[in-house]
């Protein structure tokens, strides 16, 4: 019988290399059965994960999986670091593995994104 526990499918030691100034979507794949859990994002500061308040988030549905998305519009250098999503399910908190954003400092105007780069993200 298939488990109906909530599961968060962020791979251990996953990371994304991104550019400051670009839009970016950080996805937390969420598997649930009947009721969609409340999901939040936090950012690691040492051993503490600080909840991200007031950020632009959204849900996306794909077949058997939902994605809770944290939007960066655009990425800034201080977004560098590790993030974790967590789900509140039946009064229990399920935490994902952390995923790391490596934000590249691009300071040269000649290294702008191509015309289609913003559109494609």
């Amino acid at each position: 019988k298939e488990s109906c526990d909530v599961q968060l499918y962020i791979k251990r030691q996953s990371y994304h290399s991104i550019f400051a100034g670009d839009p970016f979507k950080l996805e937390c794949p969420v598997k649930y059965c009947a009721h969609r859990p409340q999901v939040t994002w936090c950012k690691l500061n040492g051993t503490t994960c600080v909840k991200l308040e007031g950020r632009h988030t959204s849900w996306k549905q794909e077949k058997n999986l939902s994605f809770f998305i944290l939007h960066f519009e655009p990425v800034l250098p201080s977004d560098n670091g590790s993030y974790r999503c967590s789900a509140n399910f039946l009064s229990a908190i399920i935490e994902s593995h952390s995923t790391t954003l490596y934000v590249t400092d691009v300071k040269s105007a000649s290294e702008r994104p191509s015309k289609d780069e913003m559109a494609s993200r």
Epitope: H71, L76, V106, P113, A119, R121
Partner: antibody, heavy 119, light 107 residues
């Protein structure tokens, strides 16, 4: 030539709402963020938020979240900022600006829209 | 929030003099600082981005320098048309923030 043409001055009563427009020309609208900035009484500048014209994705200053609503109309290359339930504290000049990327900076500015909230 | 502190609040200079405006960030912002010039009754104009990159069409008498927390805008030989408010701003971290501005007046 890049231009950001903002709507004209507004004189409104407390409690009313306004929608300020910013029409972009001279560049591809979807290649750059649009930024909104408040300047009260010729004083310092306050960042309100950014909007990505491709997908309508926004980032707001927490101070203005729930106060300002940023939208775009890609077909007319126009960005909008809605301000509901106005008070005298909202009286200011509001600017739209194009967001240059990597790093983010504001390379072209609209002429500003003066909002006066008074009974 | 990162606080950008500009000094002095205002300064009076004679044409031809060298002007140095200061902007200090309350925490490290790398080189993610821009400088804007705002003439009376006009909208701001970009002068410098990335702390030291002069924007297209900006006269070479304007120079930006600094990193981390201390930034400077220098006008090597001030002209009458430079009478304006000068604002610094950081784009290192949300919320984006600006200094209170320095008003440059001519004697």
């Amino acid at each position: 030539e890049v231009q950001l043409q903002q709507s004209g001055p507004e004189l409104v009563q407390p409690g009313a709402s306004v929608k300020i427009s910013c029409k972009a020309s001279g560049y591809t609208f979807t290649d750059y963020y649009m930024i909104w900035v408040k300047q009260s009484h010729g004083k310092s500048l306050e960042w309100i938020g950014n909007i990505n014209p491709n997908n309508g994705g926004t980032t707001y200053n927490q101070k203005f979240k729930g106060k300002a609503t940023l939208t775009v109309d890609k077909s007319s290359s126009t960005a909008y900022m809605g301000l509901p339930s106005l008070t005298s504290e909202d009286s200011a000049v509001y600017y739209c600006a194009r967001g240059g990327l990597r790093p983010l900076y504001f390379d072209y500015w609209g002429q500003g829209t003066t909002l006066t909230v008074s009974s | 929030n990162i606080v950008m502190t500009q000094s002095p609040k205002s300064m009076s200079m004679s044409v031809g003099e060298r002007v140095t405006l200061s902007c200090k960030a309350s925490e490290n912002v790398d080189t993610y600082v821009s400088w804007y010039q705002q003439k009376p009754e006009q909208s701001p104009k970009l002068l410098i981005y990335g702390a030291s990159n002069r924007y297209t069409g900006v006269p070479d008498r304007f120079t930006g320098s600094g990193s981390a927390t201390d930034f400077t805008l220098t006008i090597s030989s001030v002209q009458a048309e430079d009478l304006a408010d000068y604002h610094c701003g950081q784009s290192y971290s949300y919320p984006l923030t600006f200094g209170a501005g320095t008003k440059l007046e001519l004697i």
